[in-house]
């Protein structure tokens, strides 16, 4: 036997108080599938959230972060605040690398620069706050069409919870 | 793409009405529509909305006093009642989208409702 | 219901002047706001939407602000062909009475 509610479209929900028959998910609620008994109500984009694309009748609000703020988790459940480059966020704020690490964007943690002497290369420019070590080519490598410059470090996920 | 009202008449105070807009070009499943009128002189007055999914929102003053209807093309307004302050200026609109929260980008011309004994 | 107020109910400018019109929400409403331009025998055209992006062909003279409850609409380097009634009118959805669609009184512009 066929259940009825497999027939109400997106949009719409499986209404037992009126005999199962499908109604149309009311303003600020959706649903993204059919046959559902319940509409879900719409996400809030609010405070330092921004609405990106908005609630229908079919889909629920997308939000992401107002300008200094990036998104974290899955669907921007969470917005970070913003460091400037050669910085990352603590629990006190933005806080400068420490010597010795680096940060080339507006999030994530100060990673140590590269160890070129590890891999028996020169140090070709020095490393900055907001800037890896370049290292140069090996003494062997100085071949013709060699590639002169290691890439950076891999970047990590930040080890810390969001503010 | 196009909205066109139609049914605009004189009517006697008390005698329903009932007025169509019908639509082409797009589909009345994607996208909501308003009925909003506007008295001779004055501002316009939104009566009511069909959402893109079928759900129907009066202007809370409305009591009763129109009905909205949606079939695939035509969206209808019927003045259940006309008295001599429902003489207007009918416009239908479509969104510019099917969110709840949209506005309202294509209009008809209008159809004038004149109640009078 | 939301109660749009809109001021003043006319105002009168020089052709290249600038027109401020404002319009006031009686609950926050975001940025969910539209102005509309009216013509005597023509339908409303939407002029803006969000608050402040401009519609699709809209003269770059127009320019919306605000968000909340308080909203402008200002006409800058006025033409002739900017005599109309202006009307705002929220867009949101999903206030305590489901009720978000309503009008601005209008302000009726004058180009001299």
């Known amino acids: 036997l066929q259940d009825p509610c497999s027939n109400c479209p997106a949009g719409t929900f499986c209404d037992n108080n009126r005999n199962q028959i499908c109604s149309p998910c009311p303003p600020n609620s959706f649903s993204s599938a059919g046959g559902q008994r319940t509409c879900d109500i719409c996400r809030q984009c609010k405070g330092v959230f921004r609405t990106r694309k908005e609630c229908s009748s079919t889909s629920n609000a997308e939000c992401d972060c107002t300008p200094g703020f990036h998104c974290l988790g899955a669907g921007c459940s969470m917005c970070e605040q913003d460091c400037k480059q050669g910085q990352e966020l603590t629990k006190k704020g933005c806080k400068d690398c420490c010597f010795g690490t680096f940060n080339d964007q507006k999030r994530g943690i100060c990673r140590p620069w590269t160890n070129c002497s590890l891999a028996g290369k020169p140090v070709l420019m020095n490393g900055t706050k907001a800037r890896d070590v370049v290292c140069g080519p090996r003494p062997a490598d100085l071949s013709p069409g060699a590639s002169s410059v290691t890439p950076p470090a891999p970047a990590r996920e930040p080890g810390h919870s969001p503010q | 793409q196009s909205v066109e009202e139609s049914g605009g008449r004189l009517v006697t105070p008390g005698t329903p009405l009932t007025l169509t807009c019908t639509v082409s070009g797009f589909s009345l499943s994607t996208y909501a529509m308003i009925w909003v009128r506007q008295a001779p002189g004055k501002g316009l007055e939104w009566i009511g909305v069909v959402y893109d999914n079928g759900y129907i929102s009066h202007a809370t003053w409305v009591k009763g006093r129109f009905t909205i209807s949606k079939t695939s093309t035509t969206v209808g307004l019927e003045i259940t009642s006309p008295t001599t302050e429902d003489t207007a200026t009918y416009f239908c609109?479509?969104?510019?989208?099917?969110?709840?929260?949209?506005?309202?980008?294509?209009w008809g011309q209008g159809t004038l409702v004149t109640v009078s004994s | 219901d939301i109660v749009m107020t809109q001021t003043p109910a006319s105002v009168e400018a020089a052709v290249g002047g600038t027109v401020t019109i404002k319009c006031q929400a009686s609950e926050s409403i975001s940025n969910y706001l539209a102005w509309y331009q009216q013509k005597p025998g023509q339908p409303p055209k939407l002029l803006i939407y969000?608050?402040?992006t401009l519609a699709s062909g809209v003269s770059s003279r127009f320019k919306g602000s605000g968000s909340g409850t308080e909203f402008t609409l200002t006409i800058s380097d006025l033409e002739s062909a900017d005599a109309a009634t202006y009307y705002c009118?929220?867009?949101?959805?999903?206030?305590?009475?489901?009720?978000?669609?309503?009008f601005g009184g209008g302000t009726e512009v004058v180009v001299k």
């Open positions: 009118q929220t867009n949101y959805c999903c206030s305590s009475s489901d009720n978000g669609f309503a």
């Open positions: 969000k608050a402040s």
């Open positions: 609109a479509r969104s510019a989208d099917g969110s709840w929260s949209t506005y309202f980008n294509l």
